[in-house]
Interface confidence: low
């Protein structure tokens, strides 16, 4: 047994300058830290529980964020983070430190939490050694910290597995022998193989089970006859008739997750490590008290005994411990080639030119879905669209009522008349054309195309609004 201790020295912007947090907190805030320990150096599954333990720090002093000013080192909670461990210290472990910010505004439902930074490091560390210092970057943040593992008496040693007591308290008692030289302590004999018979077995090396005379079997629980071997019950050798050890229920160790097996009559029993229970230590016994939910996940006690807790994950996280960040951009939510930005608290799409909308779903260059009011028609061109409006209407969407004669379209003093299908110009003497734009020569010949037969100079010229150059 022992305690893992973590001391946070500073948390603030790294050399690159002030991080720009996507959360943009307003009002007072305070920091707190969460530490999670997992056994082994292997790449742990992200959602695996903190099997060695977890701890939450106290809240730090209140501070107020200055959005424009570069953030200094942020004020830290007092004291150590301590994670007690009941069994042997594994020596190799994964250390996960999360920095959380608590916003103390007037949010409905209490303070809001947001994860500022998370560092994960695999480390080797012997118990009883000095403090190990570390500096880790998490995005633009920098975290400085120290950690150590120490045993709690009577456990001593690099794994806290040697059980010692001061000699002054009592002389080395039965089964105990002196510790290493220069230590005023006594030490237990090596730990034999799990389930090794206390009466009939012994060991000189850890994990061993050697049998006293008259006993056999992997755990020294099977008696060996010294005479004819007849009359004994149990499996017998066909060649000698003598009893031979049958397969023991602990053969191969059926106990999962580091449990130790001991034989019982006709069966076995597993002694499970902290965090596991069940016939074969197969059920995770981590509870909400162990703080198994990451990233602000809400921990509730499982209704099923084999599910000691359930983490309800906030948006953007998944996994049984909310430790997997959902790569929401992998679902390609942004349409039309938009760039996806996962800001943590929200998704944003940066749209290419000509597209708009939360998911870049609107094509600004597309007449599809574009409504031109009052009978106007949508015209595409030049990477944009516009409405060509019916007579009497104008504006971007043809929603504004317009007077077709307001622009004085009839030249040379021609008179303009609004018409349901366009406008009509009544030209002054000497002019002709749809907009009275052509002078008539004194000899009666026009300089440009002559008026059609039957149309005298000065007669009104119909000019449909949607035709630019229409000559009769």
């Amino acid at each position: 047994a022992g305690v893992f201790e973590l001391q946070i020295h500073s948390f603030g912007p790294g050399p690159g300058g002030a991080p720009r947090s996507p959360y943009s907190a307003r009002g007072p805030c305070r920091l707190f830290f969460r530490v999670c320990l997992k056994p082994g150096l292997s790449e742990e599954a992200a959602e695996s529980p903190c099997a060695l333990g977890a701890a939450l720090s106290a809240r730090g002093p209140v501070y107020t964020e200055q959005p424009e000013a570069p953030a200094p080192d942020l004020p830290l909670p007092n004291g150590l983070l301590q994670v007690p461990f009941r069994d042997a210290w594994p020596g190799t472990f994964s250390l996960i430190i999360e920095t959380w910010r608590e916003e103390l505004g007037d949010q409905i439902g209490g303070p809001a939490w947001s994860l500022l930074a998370r560092v994960t490091r695999r480390r080797r560390l012997a118990a009883g050694g000095p403090w190990a210092g570390d500096i880790q970057r998490a995005g633009a943040w920098e975290l400085r910290f120290s950690y150590r593992a120490r045993c709690e008496l009577p456990a001593v040693g690099t794994a806290c597995t040697r059980l010692c007591r001061p000699r002054s308290a009592s002389r080395c008692g039965p089964g105990l022998r002196p510790c290493a030289p220069l230590e005023d302590e006594c030490e237990a004999p090596p730990v034999c193989r799990a389930g090794c018979s206390l009466e009939h077995g012994f060991c000189e090396q850890p994990g061993e089970c050697r049998c006293l005379e008259g006993w056999t079997g992997p755990l020294c629980m099977v008696p060996v006859s010294t005479s004819s071997c007849l009359g004994l019950r149990g499996p017998s050798s066909t060649t000698t008739g003598c009893l031979v050890p049958g397969p023991g229920p602990c053969d191969g160790n059926p106990c999962a997750n580091g449990g130790s097996c001991s034989e019982t009559p006709g069966s076995f029993e597993c002694t499970c490590p902290r965090g596991f229970y069940g016939l074969r230590c197969e059920v995770s016994g981590v509870t909400c008290a162990d703080g198994p939910c990451f990233n602000g996940g809400l921990c509730v006690g499982g209704a099923d005994p084999d599910s000691a807790y359930i983490c309800h994950c906030p948006p953007g996280f998944q996994g049984s411990n909310c430790e997997k960040r959902v790569d929401r951009c992998s679902l390609q939510p942004c349409r039309n080639g938009g760039l996806c930005l996962d800001l943590g608290h929200a998704l944003r799409c940066r749209c290419r030119a000509g597209f708009a909308g939360p998911r870049c779903e609107h094509d600004l260059n597309d007449c599809a879905g574009r409504a031109c009011a009052n009978g106007g028609t949508c015209v595409e061109g030049g990477g944009a669209h516009r409405c060509s409006c019916a007579l009497g209407f104008g504006g971007r969407d043809c929603r504004e009522r317009a007077d077709p004669c307001a622009a004085r379209p009839c030249a040379h003093g021609g008179r303009c008349y609004a018409h349901f299908s366009g406008l009509v110009c009544a030209c002054a003497p000497g002019y002709m054309g749809a907009r009275c734009e052509f002078p008539v020569h004194p000899d009666g010949v026009s300089a440009l195309p002559a008026a059609p037969p039957g149309l005298r100079p000065g007669d009104p010229q119909r000019y449909p609004h949607h035709h630019h150059h229409h000559h009769h």
Epitope: S42, A45, P249, D251, G252, N253, P254, A256, N257, S267, F268, Y277, G278, L279, R280, C281, E282, V283, P305, D306
Partner: antibody, heavy 118, light 113 residues
């Protein structure tokens, strides 16, 4: 998605040794699962052969224990079955499967038919 | 070894009707420390490997339709298909995983009447 793939000779001579390998995809053989072998003679039911943990710990069906060896190769993320002194009664479809630590077999290979015949 | 006995050996049920399969173990598979029954149910269709339906005697595996349900404790267990569908035609096996040696029932064949 976890997938398991059995491989090995489909024909073994009587008194010989049957050897099969199961490669695991989508999960680490070093995870907290046991890895099992199950067989099914043609037209018959399922028979559990044994299991292995990544540490090398094994549990075997008592009726086959004297002939069975199951081992694990962590570097190749695979585990293997050896069944010695085979007879025609060992002709079966052999499946490898993942046993969640409790014991229910939640992922299975497609199975491979091994015929014992001379 | 714990012996698992299923009944009936085969079962013919009309589409939409209820099918019930029984499984009896020769000794209890209930582990008192966590009150769990170490029993699973599997479905096997021709030419396919078995597919886990239920574990802990009554916990449905992810993705299994809710018409499948397991019940029972100690030595007596049942698998019920509340409304038989055409795709449920298969052989169903129970399995105990108590201890260090596991055994299956002999199987129950479910057909459409």
């Amino acid at each position: 998605q976890v997938q398991l793939q059995e491989s090995g000779p489909g024909l073994v001579k009587p008194s010989g040794t049957l050897s099969l390998t199961c490669v695991v995809f989508g999960d680490s053989i070093s995870s907290s699962n046991w890895w099992s072998w199950v067989r099914q003679p043609p037209g018959k039911g399922l028979e559990w052969i044994g299991e292995v943990f990544h540490s090398g710990s094994t549990n075997y069906n008592p009726s086959l224990k004297s002939r069975v060896t199951i081992s694990v190769d962590k570097s190749k993320n695979q585990f293997s079955l050896k069944l010695s002194s085979v007879t025609a009664a060992d002709t079966a479809v052999y499946y490898c499967a993942r046993a969640a630590v409790a014991g229910a077999l939640d992922y299975w290979g497609q199975g491979t038919l091994v015929t014992v015949s001379s | 070894d714990i012996v698992m006995t299923q009944s009936p050996d085969s079962l013919a049920v009309s589409l939409g009707e209820r099918a019930t399969i029984n499984c009896k173990s020769s000794q209890s598979v209930l582990y008192s420390s966590n009150n769990k029954n170490y029993l699973a149910w599997y479905q096997q269709k021709p030419g396919q490997p078995p597919n886990l339906l239920v574990y802990w005697a009554s916990t449905r595996e992810s993705g299994v339709p809710d018409r499948f349900s397991g019940a029972g404790s100690g030595t007596d267990f049942t698998l019920t298909i509340s409304s038989l569908q055409a795709e449920d035609v298969a052989v169903y096996y129970c399995q105990q995983y108590y201890g260090t040696s596991w055994t299956f029932g002999q199987g129950t064949k479910v057909e459409i009447k």
